[in-house]
């Protein structure tokens, strides 16, 4: 909000990509002057309260648990801070996605999964029977929504030139533009290994 910088943070304590019936903990940054912190979900431009925490003197960042994740709980979340009757602040938004609503796509690579820094690899996500119009590539353990997204079918994700940080387990998901927070089951996993050394044995997981 104008003049109210920096914007308070909101974060998921685990991945914001949550399986159906799973759970996630959301943390709102504590605002000193707020007497009440509310977690809101935004659906069709309407704000609905999910939970509230009154201020306590031993203030820590208020946490909210979203459990039994489903289509109704997927979407954009925001922390609303009540400073007074007519004074509020708002955090940034956090997007939560629910998975397991459609059949899983298939993830494949155009080369071997052990790479040297600087090399390129392309991962392809496809679905033979479900006409998804969007695909997302997710890396296991990431605490933010996948940055890699494609509107093509099949979807090609170019990872490169790679560095050591690219190492990890990858899965892809299919979804529809009209329901951007409802994703498919995860695809098969591919483990990419980026190494300086070519003298070790690596196995790939599929």
């Amino acid at each position: 909000q104008e003049g109210d910088f920096p914007m308070p943070f909101i974060s998921a304590k685990s991945s914001p990509v949550i399986p159906l019936d799973g759970s996630v903990k959301i943390q709102c940054q504590a605002i000193r002057e707020a007497y009440l912190t509310q977690l809101m979900i935004i659906k069709n431009s309407t704000y609905r309260e999910i939970g509230r925490r009154l201020k306590f003197w031993n203030e820590t960042d208020p946490e909210f648990v979203i459990d039994h994740m489903d289509a109704n709980k997927a979407g954009r979340y925001q922390c609303q801070y009540r400073i007074g009757h007519y004074r509020f602040r708002y955090s940034d938004t956090l997007e939560l996605v629910v998975t397991g609503l459609y059949g899983k796509p298939f993830l494949s690579a155009d080369r071997g999964l052990v790479l040297m820094p600087g090399e390129n690899i392309s991962l392809t996500c496809s679905s033979a029977h479900i006409p998804f119009d969007r695909f997302s590539l997710a890396k296991e353990g990431e605490l933010s929504l996948p940055q890699h997204q494609s509107g093509e079918h099949p979807a090609n994700f170019s990872l490169g030139p790679v560095d050591l940080n690219v190492s990890g387990i990858y899965r892809c998901y299919g979804w529809y533009n009209r329901s951007p927070y409802l994703w498919s089951f995860p695809s098969n996993a591919l483990e990419l290994v980026v190494t300086d050394s070519i003298h070790q044995d690596y196995t790939t997981q599929n």
């Epitope: 809101m40 007074g84 009757h85």
Partner: antibody, heavy 122, light 112 residues
Framework: QIQLVQSGPELKKPGETVKISCKAS????????MNWVKQAPGKGLKWMAW????????THTDDFKGRFVFSLETSASTAYLQINNLKNEDTATYFC???????????????WGQGTTLTVSS | DVVMTQTPLTLSVTIGQPASMSCKSS???????????LNWLLQRPGQSPKSLIY???KQDSGVPDRFTGSGSGTDFTLKISRVEAEDLGVYYC?????????FGGGTKLEIK
């Protein structure tokens, strides 16, 4: 500059409905609250409602529940006051006023529309 | 509700002379954020209200320096150092600390 421009005067019969608009310009609409204030002829100012323009949630006094609908069209930076089943005592000038919402000093300043005169008469 | 009491009801002043009006609230207007949400408005005859002072003493843009607001807690004052013809109208104080917002009954400034 900051402006709140309200719709024109209205002449209605008892039982009818009126919808008054207040179009804001010169600032980010969602960052400041919107108020509606009633002034009956020859009387003082009476606060009706405050709308959190960020969420669209209205807060109003018991005197203005039921027949009164406070709404927003955020994309058009416009607030609306709708009064259903009009009564003679609704005859007044209605003002919108920007105030509140943020925690900055700017949010504590008030800006007023020019007013909309509503006459309810059979 | 917080009651805002303005005195006097009517103030008759000669042009060039000072004027002072009072606004008292039934509860302290100091909010938990340390601010006091007390504003003053002027409503000239046939016009919409115009903001003069916000947060007790801060002058709104375009408001002449002859207007000053002061006070704290429950007692507030608006002073005009030298009244001009354009100052006539009804002056309202209002509070935005407590729900619901409430206005004073107004002080009518007339020119003698």
């Amino acid at each position: 500059q900051i402006q709140l421009v309200q719709s024109g005067p209205e002449l209605k019969k008892p039982g009818e409905t009126v919808k008054i608009s207040c179009k804001a310009s010169g600032y980010t609409f969602k960052n400041y609250g919107m108020n509606w204030v009633k002034q009956a002829p020859g009387k003082g100012l009476k606060w009706m409602a405050w709308i959190n323009t960020y969420t669209g949630e209205p807060t109003h006094t018991d005197d203005f529940k039921g027949r009164f609908v406070f709404s927003l069209e955020t994309s058009a930076s416009t607030a609306y006051l709708q009064i259903n089943n009009l009564k003679n005592e609704d005859t007044a000038t209605y003002f919108c006023a920007r105030w509140g919402l943020g925690t900055t000093e700017e949010a504590a300043r008030d800006y007023w529309g020019q007013g909309t005169t509503l006459t309810v008469s059979s | 509700d917080v009651v805002m009491t303005q005195t006097p009801l009517t103030l008759s002043v000669t042009i060039g002379q000072p004027a002072s009006m009072s606004c008292k609230s039934s509860q302290s207007l100091l909010d938990s954020d340390g601010k006091t949400y007390l504003n003053w408005l002027l409503q000239r005859p046939g016009q919409s209200p115009k903001s003069l002072i916000y947060l007790v003493s801060k002058q709104d843009s375009g408001v002449p320096d002859r207007f000053t607001g002061s006070g704290s807690g429950t007692d507030f004052t608006l002073k005009i150092s030298r009244v001009e013809a354009e100052d006539l109208g009804v002056y309202y104080c209002w509070q935005g600390t407590h729900f619901p917002q409430t206005f004073g009954g107004g002080t009518k400034l007339e020119i003698k």
